[in-house]
């Protein structure tokens, strides 16, 4: 079966929205009113991977852009990046592992764990206007909890 993708936005548990910061980076900041239109709309694809009731493997692309969040080693550290792909081949059901995140729902929050690097999560800083990154700690200063708002195509 072909891969199905649904559009969504994300906010961290402090209600910060995600926006583009240059061509290959996301940052998190509080938005309101008309500024909400700046927030990134993701195309979330349901991809192949280990699955349970609370854990669903997904890929997070930027809507109508050939950019996907991916997890790679940089200087021996798991790092989040926006990676450009060939739009003729993506999205696909069997995404490379660096593109796959385990969407985990715990109580009323979502976490996005890297499939490539277990226990590393999409994270934001407490501070405003800082890059979205891959963090290796939960429950510390950095924020790993999100809510998702699906939006019409």
């Amino acid at each position: 079966a072909p891969v199905r993708s649904l559009n969504c936005t994300l906010r961290d548990s402090q209600q910060k929205s995600l926006v583009m910061s240059g061509p290959y980076e996301l940052k998190a900041l509080h938005l309101q009113g008309q500024d909400m239109e700046q927030q990134v709309v993701f195309s979330m694809s349901f991809v192949q991977g280990e699955e349970s009731n609370d854990k669903i493997p997904v890929a997070l692309g930027l809507k109508e852009k050939n950019l996907y969040l991916s997890c790679v080693l940089k200087d021996d550290k798991p790092t989040l990046q926006l990676e450009s792909v060939d739009p003729k081949n993506y999205p696909k059901k069997k995404m490379e592992k660096r593109f796959v995140f385990n969407k985990i729902e715990i109580n009323n929050k979502l976490e996005f764990e890297s499939a490539q690097f277990p226990n590393w999560y999409i994270s934001t800083s407490q501070a405003e206007n800082m890059p979205v990154f891959l963090g290796g700690t939960k429950g510390g200063q950095d924020i790993t909890d999100f809510t998702m708002q699906f939006v019409s195509s």
Epitope: N7, C8, E105, N108, T147, M148, Q149, F150
Partner: antibody
């Protein structure tokens, strides 16, 4: 046996508010995504709100966005739909429905509660 | 939004008849289609999902087929309890929309 029982419907004036409830039993409510679907007289079914099992994900179509909110209390096995700024076109039978985990089909529905918006 | 068009909007048939209802979509939804049955004054009930998979407890006289943009629900031998409204729904992209319904009446 899966049971979904809606309540809270009634007559409300345009611009008014109403809160619908759906009491669930016969299954582990906290493990299922839930939705509200409505059916206006003589019209097709319309999906109006979605919430994931833990409440971390939601969806509203443009027709109700900004006016309706969906929530759930997993400890009480109850789903809610808060409807504000109601319009005549919101008049419908409102059903709560249990949904497959990956945002797909509705496998069980309640019997519905009628909401009438009229002055 | 993907538009769903059912045909016919109503039909009259007799017990034992073979009945076919069609659902067309404005875009390719692959096999992401569901069929529901709704009896008067009752809640809809799931009949078929993924275009052709019968839901638990649904009699084998019901079957679904199709993919892409054209789908059919077939009742091989209509029974008295099958007189109802039937709706298709896609779940390929948001919003998941329903067809306008097909009313199956007694001839």
């Amino acid at each position: 046996e899966v049971q979904l029982v809606e309540s809270g419907g009634g007559l409300v004036q345009p611009g008014g508010s109403l809160r619908l409830s759906c009491a669930a039993s016969g299954f582990d409510f906290s493990r299922y995504d839930m939705s509200w679907v409505r059916q206006a007289p003589g019209k097709r079914l319309e999906w109006v709100a979605y919430i994931s099992s833990g409440g971390g994900s939601t969806y509203f179509p443009d027709t109700v966005k900004g006016r309706f909110t969906i929530s759930r209390d997993n400890a009480k096995n109850t789903l809610y739909l808060q409807m504000n700024s109601l319009r005549a076109e919101d008049t419908a039978v409102y059903y709560c429905a249990r949904q497959n985990k990956k945002l797909t089909w509705f496998d069980y529905w309640g019997q519905g509660t009628l909401v009438t918006v009229s002055s | 939004d993907i538009q769903m068009t059912q045909s016919p909007s109503s039909l009259s048939a007799s017990v034992g008849d073979r009945v076919t209802i069609t659902c067309r979509t404005s875009g390719n939804i692959h096999n992401y289609l569901t069929w529901y049955q709704q009896k008067l004054g009752k809640a809809p009930q799931l009949l078929v999902y993924n275009a052709k998979t019968l839901a638990d407890g649904v009699p084998s006289r019901f079957s679904g087929s199709g993919s892409g943009t054209q789908f059919t629900l077939t009742i091989s031998s209509l029974q008295p309890e099958d007189f109802a409204n039937y709706y298709c729904q896609h779940f390929w992209s948001l919003p998941f929309t329903f067809g306008q319904g097909t009313k199956v009446e007694i001839k």
